[in-house]
């Protein structure tokens, strides 16, 4: 019986060369989170946060992905190719999987200042 809901940072934008936080939050469930997977638009895994083993950042992203805050993920040195969908998948007992979606748009540095609610200065 899946009672929980995933809240995400939704659609966000950030400057090329900058950093951004991808954040998902699971609420309204008693379920226990055993693992959180972060995937990119092409379904490649960026990182896994495991309850026992901690964080694992996949080699292709090691230089540009930082774990946290919390179960979130920080993308650094953004390029235009980083534009696209990102997914968080919560593995929970006994509910099963919850999946959240974030759309990131990377803007050229020349573009006017944008909402920086989830951006790191």
């Amino acid at each position: 019986m899946m009672t929980g809901t995933i809240e995400t940072t939704g659609n966000i934008s950030a400057k090329k060369g900058g950093s951004v936080i991808l954040q998902c939050h699971l609420s309204s469930t008693m379920a226990q989170v055993t693992q959180v997977n972060w995937e990119q638009h092409d379904h490649s895994l960026l990182a896994i946060r495991n309850a026992e083993l901690g964080w694992h950042i996949y080699p292709a992203f090691k230089d540009r992905v930082a774990p946290g805050p919390g179960l979130g993920l920080t993308l650094q040195s953004l390029t235009m190719n980083d534009t696209g969908e990102y997914f968080c998948t919560y593995h929970t007992y006994p509910d099963g999987t919850y999946r959240g979606r974030i759309f990131l748009e990377v803007l050229e540095s020349s573009v006017a200042e944008h909402s920086a609610r989830f951006q790191i200065p």
């Epitope: 019986m1 008693m30 379920a31 226990q32 989170v33 055993t34 693992q35 997977n37 495991n50 309850a51 026992e52 083993l53 593995h91 929970t92 007992y93 006994p94 099963g96 999987t97």
Partner: antibody, heavy 122, light 106 residues
Framework: EIQLVQSGSELKKPGASVKVSCKAS????????MNWVRQAPGQGLEWMGW????????TYAQGFTGRFVFSLDTSVSTAYLQISSLKAEDTAVYYC???????????????WGQGTMVTVSS | AIRLTQSPSFLSASVGDRVTITCRAS??????LAWYQQKPGKAPKLLIY???TLQSGVPSRFSGSGSGTEFTLTISSLQPEDFATYYC????????FGGGTKVEIK
Amino acid sequence: EIQLVQSGSELKKPGASVKVSCKASGYTFTSYPMNWVRQAPGQGLEWMGWINTNTGNPTYAQGFTGRFVFSLDTSVSTAYLQISSLKAEDTAVYYCARVGGYSVDEYAFDVWGQGTMVTVSS
Amino acid sequence: AIRLTQSPSFLSASVGDRVTITCRASQGISSYLAWYQQKPGKAPKLLIYAASTLQSGVPSRFSGSGSGTEFTLTISSLQPEDFATYYCQQLNSYPTFGGGTKVEIK
């Protein structure tokens, strides 16, 4: 070695209470959900419910609400099952069992306690 | 709640026999099924999870298959230590167990 060690057998009178302990070792206690399973004499396995070892929140299966309480002491990596107002039909072996695996595809009860026999008799 | 029906309830077999136990779910559970072995006076032991993945340390004569509503546990060549009761369990929602299959010596 990963193991769950339960407290010893109990003989109780109807109406009394009992508290069964389940001590975990060899792994991070708060990383894995803990379940309780009942097996009446000569019967099959019955899932009683589980406790979130992160938050301490218990969830009880149908038929196990009211007189049954799951609790934790994370400082000593121990889960507890308390049964109050004992009845003859509570006579059974009670097991604690850890949910192993990290992704939902891997979930299963991979480590079990040895079981605690609770006998209720006047 | 999801109900699991195991068949047969009892099974008489000889050492060396190929044994198959079936578990049917009252609704689809994908591959979220585990199999356990229990010997008298002992705790259950995990044999197979995710319907077909062998738990570490379990002999390869044990195998599992199926998805959706129908699953099987197969012991390719029964050994003396395999005489026991076997249970299936679904983990698609709140866990439930099948009624068990007792494998006895013929």
